[in-house]
Interface confidence: medium
């Protein structure tokens, strides 16, 4: 009962983790500018990993998206290939802990075969909120070192436009989405693994004790019950070993060369 | 490099129109917004109104609004500004620009053009 409830705490953790990274990857506010403010108007500018926008005080709002691949700073691309490795690996784990619940039933799936799906998944969410966390971390030291306004120029790719007035930029909303979702995907993703665990189907769950003869000179006739292994009979008249009582982590429980001396 | 000539301008009696032309040279004039700007003898450069990129949107500021109205054609690398019911105190040398945003803010703006004089007599 507490493995299915861990497996499916975590898939539900993970599933919101991966709706926050896919949010925050979306969206505009990854950092905001106070471009001027007077009592009159004010005018904001805020920026995403795909677009830039305006918004004024009066309601005037307009998003203008990256022209150019290729004048956009690396640092950016890296952050946009961080998050959507991380949503692509999200979803595959999404899919894969589907299968993988205990509470769902598909034919005759063997609990082992869902304990490896459930890992997989698991370690899946991690790498996936690690990558998300990574990214908004990446980009949150490109604003801290004032990265991004000395290198992203907007207006590349626009006949090379500059800017008039530089001032610096602070961290946007999309930011602490990123790390929160980030944080409960990799969340989601350990209680998967400590699922994982409790869903393996263990050899023995409990410890079986063997009774073995304890004379040294006892000899059973042909046809005997062979008490220290339950196999067969002790045709060759030898006497058995005498072990005492054994646990089976001890012993085989099986006829070998060991049984016999 | 993109270029702005304003254009249009002149003496108008209260109450009157008159209609500034924005020509622009270079073939990415269709990538910026265009802003209008005033400037009053004595007085800070203000905004008065701004087109998108693509004309689909409009902004303008509060002493202009229902008398001025923006638009551009792409085609002809051109905007304007057409105002109405013009008023004394809309004297002043108009300044078109061409910028990333329709913003009100005029940092937003990376190409000037030197301004056309508009007089309103009363």
């Known amino acids: 009962m507490a493995v299915t409830a861990c497996q499916g705490l975590g898939f539900v953790v993970s599933l919101i983790g991966i709706a926050g990274i896919i949010a925050a990857t979306c969206m505009d506010q990854w950092s905001t500018q106070d471009l001027y403010n007077n009592p009159v108007t004010a005018v904001f500018n805020y920026q995403g990993l795909w677009r830039s926008c305006v918004r004024e005080s009066s309601g005037f709002t307009e998003c203008r998206g990256y022209f150019t691949l290729l004048g956009l700073p690396a640092m950016l691309q890296a952050v946009r290939a961080l998050m959507i490795v991380g949503i692509v690996l999200g979803a595959i784990g999404l899919l894969v802990s589907i299968f993988a619940l205990k509470c769902i039933r598909i034919g005759s799936m063997e609990d082992s075969a869902k304990a490896n799906m459930t890992l997989t998944s698991g370690i899946m969410f991690i790498v996936s909120g690690l990558c998300a966390i990574a990214g908004v971390s990446v980009f949150a030291n490109m604003l801290v070192t004032n990265f991004w306004m000395s290198t992203a120029n907007m207006y590349t790719g626009m006949g090379g436009m500059v800017q008039t007035v530089q001032t610096r930029y602070t961290f946007g909303a999309a930011l602490f989405v990123g790390w929160v979702a980030g944080g409960l995907t990799l969340i989601g993703g350990v209680m998967m693994c400590i699922a994982c665990r409790g869903l393996a189907p263990e050899e023995t769950n409990y410890k079986a004790v063997s009774y073995h003869a304890s004379g040294h000179s006892v000899a059973y006739k042909p046809g005997g019950f062979k008490a220290s292994t339950g196999f067969g009979s002790n045709t060759k008249n030898k006497k058995i070993y005498d072990g005492g009582a054994r646990t089976e982590d001890e012993v085989q429980s099986y006829p070998s060369k060991h049984d016999y001396v | 490099e993109v270029q702005v000539q304003e254009s249009g301008g002149g003496l108008v009696q209260a109450g009157g129109s008159l209609r500034l032309s924005c020509a622009a040279s270079?073939?990415?004039?269709?990538?910026?917004?265009v802003g209008w700007f005033r400037q009053a003898p004595g007085k800070e450069r203000e905004f008065v109104a701004a087109i998108t990129w693509s004309g689909g949107s409009t902004n303008y500021a509060d002493s202009v609004k229902g008398r001025f109205t923006i638009s551009r054609d792409n085609a002809k690398n051109t905007a304007w500004l057409q105002m109405n019911s013009l008023k004394p105190e809309d004297t002043a040398v108009y300044y078109c620009a061409g910028g990333f945003f329709a913003t009100s803010y005029s940092g937003n703006y990376g190409y000037w053009g030197q301004g056309t004089q508009v007089t309103v007599s009363s």
């Open positions: 270079g073939r990415t004039f269709s990538n910026y917004a």
